[in-house]
Interface confidence: medium
């Protein structure tokens, strides 16, 4: 079965200066490749958290998401403030030569 | 061709400290987890801890958590395993070990460098 | 932790026969399951990752097989060059154990 990128809280709900849990779970360990957090679609978008590389200080993982057999790419973004508001996505990216390529999101 | 080459190895007391180093080359070392394996004198080898690619995750055997630290510095292509509080049963040779694939661990180790030697004794 | 027992410890064949090393685990690791070679005084060599798959640059007669908790490795035809200690290791959960090693002698 094909790989399904599930973010079950439609909304959440978080206090300014709180911390937000963002939570994102894939079905299958295949194809093996690495996630993005985005906020926004299209072109325009936000990257929120990068698995394979850049400095996010404020973005912390559930769980350690460079182990392979992990399927779970949640993540918490501290000291929340109004202008984090919006639409979160997990994307989940195939492994390729030379880049990676998107492959489903939540 | 891909490379480790560990150092730092020698003969200490026990309660005392040491660092190894393991220098990497040949391949992008910034892209791999990494991990340190040791094995004592005519004993099989044992798992001590692993460090993802960017040094964002570490995890250690319960041996040897709370007294060794791995680290790396990618701008070095260097690993590091800080190990304090030694004891006699740490005596063994210490490997580092490259993961096979990039930006993940649980595949294994398909690098492995030569090991340098760590006795404690008194 | 997951304990990997392997069996036997120490074993004696004749070139040309076929040797079998099996490691059990003590709960199911799916088939993240490696095999090292060892020789004496050297670094260990990954042979097989994933229970089966071959690492690169390995000769035919090494094999593996299993998923879940029972594996075995194979030697189809021993060579004096196979002279070693043979180690699987699973790669499902940290810490990531090792078998206790199987050494494999020529008759």
């Known amino acids: 079965e094909e790989l399904q990128v599930i973010q079950p809280d439609k909304s959440v709900l978080v206090a300014a200066g709180e911390t937000a849990t963002l939570r994102c779970t894939a079905t299958s360990l295949i194809p093996v490749g690495p996630i993005q957090w985005f906020r926004g679609a299209g072109p325009g978008r936000e990257l929120i958290y990068n698995q394979k590389e850049g400095h996010f200080p404020r973005v912390t993982t559930v769980s350690d998401l460079t182990k392979r057999n992990n399927m779970d790419f949640s993540i918490r973004i501290g000291n929340i403030t109004p202008a984090d508001a919006g639409t979160y996505y997990c994307v989940k990216f195939r492994k390729g030569s030379p880049d990676d390529v998107e492959f489903k999101s939540g | 061709q891909v490379q480790l080459v560990e150092s730092g190895g020698g003969v200490v007391q026990p309660g005392r400290s040491l660092r190894l180093s393991c220098a990497a080359s040949?391949?992008?070392?910034?892209?791999?987890?990494m991990h340190w394996v040791r094995q004592a004198p005519g004993k099989g080898l044992e798992w001590v801890a692993v460090?993802?690619?960017?040094?964002?995750?570490?995890y250690y055997a319960d041996s040897v958590k709370g007294r060794f630290t791995i680290s790396r510095d990618n701008s070095k292509n260097t690993l590091y395993l800080q190990m304090n509080s030694l004891r006699a049963e740490d005596t063994a040779v210490y490997y580092c070990a490259k993961e096979p694939r990039s930006y993940w661990h649980g595949y294994g180790m398909d690098v492995w460098g030569q090991g340098t030697t760590v006795t404690v004794s008194s | 932790d997951i304990q990997m027992t392997q069996s036997p410890s120490s074993l004696s064949a004749s070139v040309g026969d076929r040797v079998t090393i099996t490691c059990q685990a003590s709960q199911d690791i799916s088939n993240y399951l490696n095999w090292y070679q060892q020789k004496p005084g050297k670094a260990p060599k990954l042979l097989i990752y994933?229970?089966?798959n071959l690492e690169t640059g390995v000769p035919s007669r090494f094999s593996g097989s299993g998923s879940g908790t029972d594996f075995t490795f194979t030697i189809s035809s021993l060579q004096p060059e196979d002279i070693a200690t043979y180690y699987c290791q699973q790669v499902d959960v940290l810490p990531y154990t090792f078998g206790g090693g199987t050494k494999v002698e020529i008759k």
């Open positions: 994933d229970a089966s």
């Open positions: 460090i993802s690619y960017d040094g964002s995750n570490k």
């Open positions: 040949g391949f992008t070392f910034s892209s791999y987890g």
